[in-house]
């Protein structure tokens, strides 16, 4: 069919003479996807974010929006522009019938469009009950300056900022974008409205309960009176956030995200984006007793996302739900009966649980670590938030079974002084995201950009995989584990760690064509081994078991299953120094561990050998952990027998900068 | 060419009904929103009624709401009026029109009276 | 729903002049969705201008519109003999789509 839509071209309505631009196609090849939430009930149809490619310019973007609507209007559709993003992302909001979005998707610049979503403070219950004046604890801890360096962004409700708690502390920007309350019969009442943003600012920098008492705080209103507000409300908040840090450039930046909604591309877009612009952003887990990887912000990696757990470190359960976990929560915090300020009143306390609360705690920690050091970036913050959790306190039955392996056992604690830790070599686990059960699946296990990726495993549950190998993606190594046939799928676990100047490289072995086994070592100068993976082809690997003990004067080598490529991780870094430690067990166990001394690292962690039985190795804090299939099911042929392989690692030339700073 | 045909109109008594059809041509019908607009003999035009692209959107003047519905085949490129409960001032010729009012039908005459 | 009201009613000129149609909204009307059409007897509407100030495909240079918020105008800079005719504005912005009762060019 004939269109003559050719003629239309120029059409900008109200911009007529504007006509530079206007036939642009959209890349040949690229192109846009929608994307819309995932929970029904929280979709809001009629307001789509159109998020462009990310070198679009501002004009470009309000041209895109104005073609948009001429050529809508066209066809007949009303449009309208609510906002153009500059700043964070580029792209524009607008309201408009969802007959348009193929339309939209075609328009030139457009990289995706999402629909609208509600997103949700996270507390409950709100306002339970009075308690004047708060409880002390004994222990408190009382840090010299408080977070007195570092200022706190929170988006949240409204707040009553005259409160005892945080008078001269809150500062309330003039930004506000905010969802009509739902109901006919709702009425605003200051206090409810006030509710939840006045607890968490009093639970981040209050007077008496406040984690960070120094700390000054300026909030944002993205949450209505009932505690709902909209993934571009938050959106539009962030962009405000990295508009003034560039307009007025301060010290330290944490924002909080006392909220969650559905699981939202464009919202964990913007978090990265502002969190490589140098701000910490810490956010609630969710309330919702489920995966926080299905919910945003929680779910973006570059934000320190906190679960809840109550005063015996146990997950905190919320009437029918409770803490969100997996492995895109980062740490747990109190958050249970916390209390904070109350809106009933300017001298009022109220105790309120949630993930909100557990996020108010650890960003209150973040301030006074980054208050003591300022020039702390993101990922040596995370590094250091891990490093002084309080380990294995968390009882993980409570979470589903299939979730613990996942799930961090780690509750933040503040560090016992606030500076001295800078002679560590600092590491976390990152998991994958489940790679699926198809025959070639697979799973990636990624570092943030400023760390190194220091070894890679892989797990499946069922056994059946076929290993793990590094590879460079964008000019970053990340960690690859390989699904098998029949296998119900796998995930890969990367070894992140902080190692200044480091220069690291994987050194391949093909399989080996003797009966020996496959070896590699780091033959460069200088280079030491951090890591080891295994990768196969086949589909099962036999029960062929190469020697466990290395020869002698060779603790830079990788050995492994005849049938497999090895994998040697070498880095070389100033005074980086690493040793294999093993534990092998001659009868068949479910689970091998071998830690690291007091101060050495964990930096790898591989099973010997590598056959089927073997569902993988990962790393928990300083421990190697290599799993095997029930017991029951192997027997007790030395087939059973494993050894966990652990490369420990510790920086001389860390340690000495350290002294010589104090 | 873009083309719109208009047709079903006629003499019909009060309280009955009739509908309109308006075959579409030349472009991409279900891109397109689609309004009737109606011209009493001698008269202004007069807004009746339109509809979505996709169907799911509807809007109704108030002095046809609840009598009167429209409704879109885009299999068959074909806009509808059903019309009921038609009354004296309903006389009118009935144009169907695209999008931005840019292409008009011819219109059809629909014609109430006993 | 928003009324729009045309003045004159009717319009007396002759070929070659100037005529101005007006068009005031009772509220505010989103410019990208104003526009004025033109009919001849026994014929469909012909859409002239659209968001206010855009001359549709075909339509001659003679005609131009301008306007904002609730004061909006057709001219017609030298009449020609085929521009006698009958002249509507519309606004489709909001609901009610609502046209002005017309205001009619005759010749002089």
């Known amino acids: 069919q004939e269109d003559e839509d050719g003629d239309y071209e120029e059409l900008v309505l109200a911009l007529r003479s504007e006509e530079d631009g206007l036939a642009e196609a959209p890349e040949h090849g690229t192109t846009a996807t929608f994307h819309r939430c995932a929970k029904d009930p929280w979709r809001l149809p009629g307001t789509y974010v159109v998020v462009l490619k990310e070198e679009t310019h501002l004009s470009q973007s309000e041209r895109t929006a104005r073609r948009l609507q001429a050529q809508a209007a066209r066809r007949g559709y009303l449009t309208k522009i609510l906002h153009v993003f500059h700043g964070l992302l580029p792209g524009f909001l607008v309201k408009m019938s969802g007959d348009l979005l193929e339309l939209a998707l075609k328009l030139p610049h457009v990289d995706y469009i999402e629909e609208d979503s509600s997103v949700f403070a996270q507390s409950i219950p709100w306002n339970l009950e009075r308690i004047t004046p708060p409880r002390y604890r004994a222990d408190e801890y009382q840090p010299p300056d408080g977070g007195s360096l570092v200022e706190v962004y929170l988006l949240d409700t409204s707040i009553q900022s005259d409160h005892r708690e945080i008078e001269g502390r809150v500062m309330v920007t003039d930004f506000e974008n905010v969802p009509e309350e739902d109901g006919t019969r709702f009425h605003r009442q200051a206090s409810k409205c006030d509710s939840h943003g006045t607890h968490l600012a009093g639970v981040v920098s209050g007077r008496d309960a406040g984690v960070a008492k120094g700390a000054s705080m300026r909030s944002l209103r993205v949450l209505n009176c009932q505690g709902k507000g909209t993934v571009s409300g938050t959106l539009i908040g962030l962009e405000f956030i990295r508009k003034s840090q560039l307009v007025q450039p301060v010290g330290p930046l944490v924002v909080l995200l006392p909220l969650a909604g559905g699981y939202s591309r464009v919202l964990n877009a913007a978090c990265q984006r502002l969190a490589r612009a140098g701000v910490v952003l810490v956010t609630a887990a969710g309330n919702f007793r489920d995966d926080a990887c299905l919910y945003s912000p929680a779910s973006a990696p570059e934000v320190i996302t906190v679960g809840a757990t109550n005063a015996q470190d146990q997950p905190v359960t919320l009437g029918t739900l409770g803490t969100n976990f997996g492995r895109c929560v980062d740490l747990f915090a109190p958050g249970e009966d916390i209390i904070g300020a109350s809106s009933d009143c300017s001298t009022c306390f109220v105790s309120q649980s949630g993930t909100s609360q557990a996020a108010a705690h650890v960003a209150g920690i973040a301030a006074m670590m980054l208050s003591a050091e300022p020039e702390l970036t993101l990922a040596e913050l995370r590094q250091r938030l891990i490093h002084f959790s309080a380990k294995d306190v968390i009882n993980e039955a409570w979470f589903p079974e299939d979730q613990r392996v996942l799930t961090p056992n780690l509750v933040a604690a503040l560090p016992p002084s606030t500076h001295g830790a800078g002679w560590q070599l600092f590491c976390r686990t990152v998991w994958s995201a489940h790679s699926g059960p198809t025959r070639m699946a697979t799973a990636v296990a990624r570092c943030a950009p400023d760390e190194e990726l220091l070894s890679c495993s892989s797990f499946s549950r069922s056994g059946k995989r076929r290993g793990e190998r590094m590879e460079a993606q964008g000019g970053k190594l990340v960690c690859r584990a390989h699904n098998a046939f029949g296998g119900e799928g796998v995930y890969a676990i990367a070894r992140c760690c902080l190692l200044p100047q480091a220069n690291c490289s994987v050194h391949t072995a093909p399989p080996a064509e003797a009966s020996m086994g496959t070896r590699v070592h780091c033959h460069q100068q200088g280079h030491v081994l951090t890591g080891c993976s295994s990768h196969w082809e086949v589909e099962d690997l036999g029960t062929h078991k190469p020697p466990v003990l290395r020869p002698r004067g060779q603790p830079n080598q990788c050995v492994g299953h005849r049938e497999a490529s090895i994998h040697a991780s070498c880095c070389h870094a100033p005074g980086l120094e690493c040793k294999v430690k093993e534990h092998g067990i001659p009868a068949p166990q479910e689970q091998v561990t071998v830690a690291c001394e007091e101060g050495w690292t964990l930096t790898g962690c591989s099973a010997l050998p590598g056959t089927s039985h073997v569902l993988g190795a990962y790393a928990v804090d300083n421990t190697c952990v290599v799993r095997s299939r029930d017991v029951s099911t192997t027997g007790s042929t030395s087939e059973g027998a494993v050894t966990a392989v652990a490369i420990c690692c510790r920086s001389r030339h860390l340690a000495q900068a350290s002294q010589e700073l104090q | 060419q873009v083309q719109l045909v208009e047709s079903g109109g006629g003499l019909v008594q009060p309280g009955g009904s009739l509908r309109l059809s308006c075959a579409a041509s030349g472009f991409t019908f279900s891109d397109y929103y689609m309004h009737w607009v109606r011209q009493a003999p001698g008269k202004g035009l007069e807004w009746v009624s339109n509809?979505?692209?996709?169907?799911?959107?509807?809007y109704y003047a108030d002095s046809v709401k609840g009598r009167f519905t429209i409704s879109r085949d885009n299999s068959k490129n074909t806009l509808y009026l059903q019309m009921n409960s038609l009354r004296a001032e309903d006389t009118a010729v009935y144009y169907c029109?695209?999008?931005?009012?840019?292409?008009w039908g011819q219109g059809t005459l629909v014609t109430v009276s006993s | 729903d928003i009324v729009l009201t045309q003045s004159p009613a009717t319009l007396s000129l002759s070929p070659g002049e100037r005529a101005t149609l007006s068009c005031r909204a009772s509220?505010?009307?989103?410019?990208?969705?104003l526009a004025w059409y033109q009919q001849k007897p026994g014929q469909a509407p012909r859409l002239l201008i659209y968001?206010?100030?855009s001359r549709a495909t075909g339509v001659p240079a003679r005609f131009s519109g301008s306007g904002s918020g609730t004061d909006f105008t057709l001219t017609i800079s030298s009449l020609e003999p085929e521009d006698f005719a009958v002249y509507y504005c519309?606004?489709?912005?909001?609901?009610?789509?609502?046209f002005g009762q017309g205001t009619k060019v005759e010749i002089k």
């Open positions: 968001g206010a100030s």
């Open positions: 519309q606004q489709w912005g909001d609901v009610p789509i609502t």
């Open positions: 509220q505010s009307v989103n410019s990208n969705y």
């Open positions: 509809i979505s692209g996709s169907g799911s959107t509807t």
């Open positions: 029109a695209r999008g931005m009012f840019d292409f």
